[in-house]
């Protein structure tokens, strides 16, 4: 047969050559030749290569930066990359965890509905009627107004989204 | 296209040395490819010798490997091969080779 | 040491007709990758080696059709499918899967 002009998996088409790809973890060193492999070698210390390749160079793990709020979730290897998260109270702004803000707090007449995570943010529902919450809080849901005639008490003020009702005695009647 | 020139070769006393020499054009030494020698005997077979590859490492056949070395010199785009101790049956002619291209062999001859 | 053996070792034939030398080695040439590196070379009188075939199956640029390549592990062959006068020469295979490369001993074509 003449050289290819295919290749099959994990190799690659060079001078009318098919090569074999450098395994993940590896670079490429040297194209295959008539008479010789593909030489490759491994990634350095803080380097990796997660394919299947023929990169002259390894990718450098990525960088969790403390001043931007971040820190290493998962350590990276010669086949990963390292993956950040956000400190305590910190979200991430994209996907790719770049850099983090602050949780957000839901303010009063609104409760969480979902607490944030290291890579989402909190998520706040309006206090719908019968519940309230009258502080600016990342973790504090809607709570239920009091129940007045569970104590033997009488709603002496209405409750809103953002107050409880206010109870207080029964009027008696005289004899 | 890819061209090795040998030169070097000659007559030889016994006991004594050669350095042949192998200009490359068309292609650099350091690229890529395995760099050989070669050699054949009067109304004999190849006898590989050894090779330097493209980062200047080397390897040697064994049966030759106290006696020869393979040098090179980039900025001349030139490998040579050092051969010590002759004897009448180094007597060959000596190739260069890439393999898939081949210089035109210069003959040694070792005798007194 | 792969030790590299060819037969027959003087093969005289008809114009026209096919050919077809072996080569076997004393160890598989296959290596990790499953690629394997037997190569096969012509030598006309006088001239140097030309490679005919690499990778057990592969035409070199330039070598006619007629030349073609096959085999496995340790077994190899060439074949030659109609002869021509200019195919007059010593033909060797080359292992260069292991170090040292070896060749085999040669086999000389000639016209009936």
């Known amino acids: 047969p003449e050289p290819p002009t295919a290749c099959r998996e994990k190799q690659y088409l060079i001078n009318s050559q098919c090569c074999s790809l450098c395994q993940p973890g590896q670079k490429l060193v040297s194209d295959c030749t008539e008479f010789t492999e593909t030489e490759c070698l491994p990634c350095g210390e803080s380097e990796f290569l997660d394919t299947w390749n023929r990169e002259t160079h390894c990718h450098q793990h990525k960088y969790c930066d403390p001043n931007l709020g971040l820190r290493v979730q998962q350590k990276g290897t010669s086949e990963t990359d390292t993956i950040c998260t956000c400190e305590e109270g910190w979200h991430c702004t994209s996907e790719a965890c770049e850099s983090c803000v602050l949780h957000r707090s839901c303010s009063p007449g609104f409760g969480v509905k979902q607490i944030a995570t290291g890579v989402s943010d909190t998520i706040c529902e309006p206090c719908p009627v019968g519940f309230f919450s009258n502080v600016s809080s990342a973790f504090e849901k809607c709570h239920p107004w009091t129940s007045c005639e569970t104590k033997d008490l009488v709603v002496q003020q209405a409750g809103t989204n953002k107050t409880d009702v206010v109870c207080g005695p029964q009027d008696r009647l005289r004899a | 296209e890819v061209q090795l020139v040998e030169s070097g070769g000659g007559l030889v006393q016994p006991g004594g040395s050669l350095r042949l020499s192998c200009a490359a054009s068309g292609y650099s030494i350091t690229s890529n490819y395995y760099w050989n020698w070669v050699r054949q005997a009067p109304g004999k077979g190849l006898e590989w010798m050894g090779y330097?590859?493209?980062?200047?490492?080397?390897n040697y056949n064994p049966s030759l490997k106290n006696r020869i070395t393979i040098s090179r010199d980039t900025s001349k785009n030139t490998f040579y091969l050092q051969m010590n101790s002759l004897r009448a049956e180094d007597t060959a002619v000596y190739y260069c080779?890439?393999?898939?291209?081949w210089g035109q062999g210069t003959l040694v001859t070792v005798s007194s | 040491d792969a030790v590299m053996t060819q037969s027959p070792l003087s093969l005289p034939v008809t114009l026209g007709e096919p050919a077809s030398i072996s080569c076997r080695s004393s160890?598989?040439?296959?290596?990790?990758?499953?690629?394997?590196?037997l190569n096969w070379f012509q030598q006309k009188p006088g001239q140097s080696p030309r490679l005919l075939i690499y990778?057990?199956?592969n035409r070199f640029s330039g070598v006619p059709d007629r030349f073609s390549g096959s085999g496995s592990g340790t077994d190899f062959t060439l074949k030659i499918s109609r002869v021509e006068a200019e195919d007059v020469g010593v033909y060797y295979c080359?292992?260069?899967?292991?170090?040292?490369?070896?060749f085999g001993q040669g086999t000389k074509l000639e016209i009936k």
């Open positions: 080359l292992q260069v899967t292991h170090v040292p490369f070896t």
């Open positions: 080779a890439r393999l898939d291209y």
């Open positions: 160890q598989s040439l296959e290596n990790t990758n499953g690629n394997t590196f």
């Open positions: 330097i590859r493209y980062d200047g490492s080397n």
């Open positions: 990778r057990v199956s």
